[in-house]
Interface confidence: low
């Protein structure tokens, strides 16, 4: 039943799925709704058919309808009687189409539905001016999205009436320019989504009952709430990817949770100016709103100091140029949970009562400058609920003694890319001038560990004593183990991933013996110089094994090669010299597909390096010649 | 401390007006939504409407509109609600509760009775 | 309007077991964003009525963690896991989705 533009027809309704109250009709090519589907129909999909237009009477047939979605069919018109008779309409999706053509006509269309709380005009080229008229008069609206437009100035008019609207989403647009007023009529407002635009800065932030803002990925150089006592219910708060060059001025009182201030270009700048005359560092912003011109004077250096943030939880403030944090900060923040730091400019922290606040359960300060954490003395409960720990990519020789004694809840702990040393035995805490090494024993809580890259010397003994370690990763720490695994003996019985990559580990006389490794899941011993296959005890529930880069010249005898099909998924054996007359008794692992880069296998055959996909079944014939070589 | 303070009880002629008040301390008064709720004897509680103490806006519950009419004066913290026409229906107890953004009515009144009767 | 069903009585308890109160809504509460505009409060004989849970599931401050609401879009539960002499009286759910705010009937609970 299809035209010969190959459009299917309204009368073919076999390509609509009916489920209940609801008609799916997405992708079917049709040219028109169609007529003949049941009349009770609460929902209809006809996304990306390519109506073009949406005629009169249309969905007359539909009386009850609740929910109809148009998203990308191409519609450029929709008629003025289109929804006349579609007083249940709630939830209306005209999104990706080319309504911008005759959106006065389209205007009218949507005025005729005073119930609808739900209205997608994302992706359709509307300037200001057609969103206003579209949204006219539609008081009922709770969410609006204007997404992936043309809109560059928003004022008072663009939204006038919507005084029940909580959701309003304009991300990618060309918004440069708010003005004054644009949002105060939106009484009900608390999604205001406005990322991905143009906007340079928000200097009269004063949305009070706004419960989420994203501003991510903008130019803001400043962002500044209102002066003032009123009180703020912001609870999420998106900056990142911005340009802000100080800490965001925030309300007085706010209820503010989450805080994004990622990939900016912020710093604190006390340390740069003379401390003994701070009046000087000021900022004034001079704010124009018709005829009225107010001006706000910031201190620069405090901009924290005013702003509530008792009930944040989660501070992001990663990727930015932060190399101090000045005291009193953290402290503002008692409820603070998950602090991210990531790459910054930090070279020392100083951990004070309070500060990081006692709820902290995540800490990340990798990719920074830090030498040395700084922990105050007499504190018996700093970081008692950290879980994870983050020190990665900075220059620590070590910890203060007391550091992981007191954060008796760690569980995950990063410190991989530190110059750092194992203390050989239980280390004093009472020990004078820096810290020079770093005490894993008894931190009863510790599952996972990283300490790739460490430049570690050969381990000390018992050097994860009294630990729960489940994830341990040595990589890239050359010679730490001496062919040897018996530093890891404590740990063996619990380990479910051990990563020993790039470690110098050889097996010349002796294979390395995983036996007492129990419950090892994944094992990568990859980048070493192994040249006989490690051996596994009875009871194997390993799953990845990965030992490319090696020295390996045979393949496991059969019945090791057996006993590891049976329970393993995955084993990486690419880029190591094996013999091809060695590769017999590789069936096992070949069928069982468990082999994920058999493809890159490559063996070497009479000078030859020969992919073993390309290997016949057998013992290859050169092989039988060099075998009987060998017996003469 | 957040505290509402309502106007003390009530006694009218049918056909009369009453205006109750509601007296807001220990928070910023124009910050918050002021709702108003009436609760007859042995009944549920029924929402009049609520006014933004900032800019004077008001909304209301179709039923109540022409019946309850909503004011507030900054400069006391005090919003009011002035009833008309008074039949015995109205005879209740009125209460004002704040509008928080998480939720509504986080503070209420001690509520103010009316009674309507000749 | 969105319409707030309770039933009037609850079955009786017996002090320090658990009580389970329901209340239905004619329209889902429950918004896009995951937040379901769905509310708990408590009149005690005598008083104001007090605000127990918002939002469906928080606890509002002061209120003992023996409370506690779950639900889904229309269907939801008031649980209080011990209950004491002090949480007697009617308990209304409400929602604040859209206006007019409505309030169920109340439920009365009842102590045996």
């Known amino acids: 039943w299809r035209n010969r533009s190959g459009t299917a027809t309204a009368a073919s309704q076999g390509v609509c799925k009916l489920v209940g109250g609801a008609a799916d009709c997405r992708g079917q090519s049709l040219a028109s709704v169609p007529s003949s589907l049941p009349p009770h129909a609460r929902m209809l999909t006809l996304d990306a058919n390519p109506l073009k237009t949406l005629w009169n009477h249309s969905l007359q047939p539909y009386p009850l309808l609740e929910s109809l979605s148009l998203h990308s069919c191409h519609l450029e018109r929709i008629s003025r009687g289109a929804f006349q008779e579609q007083g249940h309409l709630r939830s209306l999706v005209l999104g990706d189409n080319c309504l911008s053509e005759n959106y006065e006509e389209t205007a009218a269309a949507l005025h005729a539905l005073p119930g609808l709380r739900r209205l997608d005009l994302s992706g359709n080229a509307l300037t200001e001016d057609m969103a206003a008229l579209m949204l006219q008069n539609l008081s009922s609206l709770r969410s609006v999205s204007l997404a992936g437009n043309t809109i560059m100035r928003l004022d008072d008019s663009v939204f006038e009436g919507l005084e029940r609207l909580r959701e309003l989403d304009l991300q990618r647009n060309y918004i440069f320019e708010i003005e004054g007023g644009a949002f105060d009529g939106l009484a009900e407002l608390r999604h205001l989504n406005l990322a991905f635009n143009n906007l340079p800065c928000i200097v009269d932030f004063g949305l009070t009952r706004l419960r989420v803002l994203n501003v991510s990925y903008n130019v803001l150089e400043w962002f500044l709430a209102t002066g003032g006592e009123a009180a703020f219910e912001l609870e999420t708060l998106d900056l990142s990817h911005n340009q802000l060059l100080f800490f965001p001025l925030l309300p007085q009182y706010s209820k503010l949770r989450t805080l994004l201030l990622r990939d900016n270009n912020m710093g604190f700048y006390r340390d740069l100016y003379n401390t003994s005359s701070p009046r000087e560092m000021v900022a004034q912003f001079l704010l124009v709103d018709g005829n009225v011109t107010n001006i706000t004077t910031v201190s620069l250096w405090e901009e924290f100091s005013s702003s509530d943030l008792a009930d944040l939880r989660f501070l992001d403030m990663s990727q930015n140029q932060f190399q101090y944090l000045p005291d009193g900060f953290l402290r503002k923040m008692p409820s603070l949970s998950h602090l991210n730091l990531h790459q910054n400019c930090l070279m020392t922290l100083h951990i004070r009562e309070h500060e990081p606040p006692g709820a902290l359960t995540e800490l990340d300060l990798s990719h920074n400058q830090l030498s040395e954490l700084h922990l105050a003395p007499g504190l018996a409960s700093c970081l008692g609920s950290l879980r994870l720990f983050n020190l990665s990519s900075n220059q620590l020789l070590g910890v203060p003694p007391g550091l992981f004694a007191n954060a008796r809840n760690i569980t995950t702990l990063d410190m991989s890319h530190n110059q750092i040393s194992l203390c050989p035995l239980p280390a004093a805490s009472d020990r004078v001038g820096p810290p020079s090494c770093v005490d894993f024993r008894n931190m009863a809580s510790l599952r996972s560990l990283s300490l790739e890259g460490c430049g570690l010397g050969a381990l000390p003994d018992c050097p994860f004593q009294g630990t729960s370690l489940t994830y341990l990763d040595l990589s890239s720490n050359w010679g730490v183990l001496n062919g040897s695994l018996a530093p890891l003996q404590d740990v063996a019985p619990m380990l479910q991933v051990l990563s020993l990559r790039n470690m110098g580990l050889h097996s010349s006389f002796m294979a390395l013996d995983f036996s007492g490794f129990g419950n090892l899941r994944d094992l990568d011993l990859s980048g070493n110089c192994l040249t006989t296959f490690p051996r596994f005890g009875g009871s194997l529930a390993l799953e990845t094994l990965d030992l490319r880069r090696n020295s390996l010249t045979a393949l496991p005898q059969k019945a090791v090669s057996e006993q590891l099909s049976r329970g393993l998924r995955t084993i990486y054996l690419s880029q190591n010299p094996y013999d091809c007359c060695g590769v017999d008794g590789w069936g096992a692992l070949q069928h069982g597909q468990t082999v994920a880069d058999w493809a890159m296998v490559t063996c070497n055959l009479s000078s030859k390096i020969i992919r073993v996909t390309e290997l016949p079944g057998g013992v290859p014939r050169d092989c039988k010649w060099e075998r009987l070589d060998l017996g003469l | 401390e957040v505290q509402l303070q309502q106007s003390g009880p009530e006694l009218v002629k049918p056909g009369a007006s009453v205006k109750i008040s509601c007296k807001a301390s220990?928070?910023?008064?124009?910050?918050?939504?002021m709702n108003w709720v009436k609760q007859s004897h042995g009944k549920s509680l029924e929402w009049i409407g609520r006014?933004?103490?900032?800019?004077?806006?008001?909304f209301y519950n179709q039923k109540f509109k022409g019946k309850a009419t909503l004011t507030v004066d900054k400069s006391s913290s005090t919003a009011h609600m002035e009833l008309l026409s008074l039949t015995s229906e109205d005879s209740a107890v009125y209460y004002c509760?704040?509008?928080?953004?998480?939720?509504?009515?986080?503070?209420w009144g001690q509520g103010t009775t009316l009674t309507v009767s000749s | 309007d969105i319409v707030m069903t309770q039933a009037a009585f609850s079955n009786p308890v017996t002090l320090g077991t658990s009580a389970s109160i329901s209340c239905r809504s004619s329209?889902?509460?429950?918004?896009?964003?995951?937040?379901?505009?769905l509310y708990w409060y408590l009149q005690k004989p005598g008083q104001s009525p007090q605000l127990l849970i918002y939002?469906?599931?928080n606890l509002a401050s002061g209120v003992p963690d023996r409370f506690s609401s779950s639900g889904s879009g229309t269907d939801f539960t008031l649980r209080i896991s011990r209950v004491e002499a002090e949480d007697v009286g009617v308990y209304y759910c409400?929602?604040?989705?859209?206006?007019?705010?409505?309030f169920g009937s109340g439920t009365k609970l009842e102590i045996k």
């Open positions: 509760g704040r509008g928080g953004y998480d939720y509504d009515f986080d503070y």
């Open positions: 220990g928070y910023s008064f124009t910050g918050y939504f």
């Open positions: 006014i933004n103490p900032y800019n004077g806006d008001t």
């Open positions: 329209k889902s509460l429950l918004q896009s964003y995951g937040i379901t505009y």
């Open positions: 939002q469906m599931s």
């Open positions: 409400a929602q604040n989705l859209e206006l007019p705010f409505t």
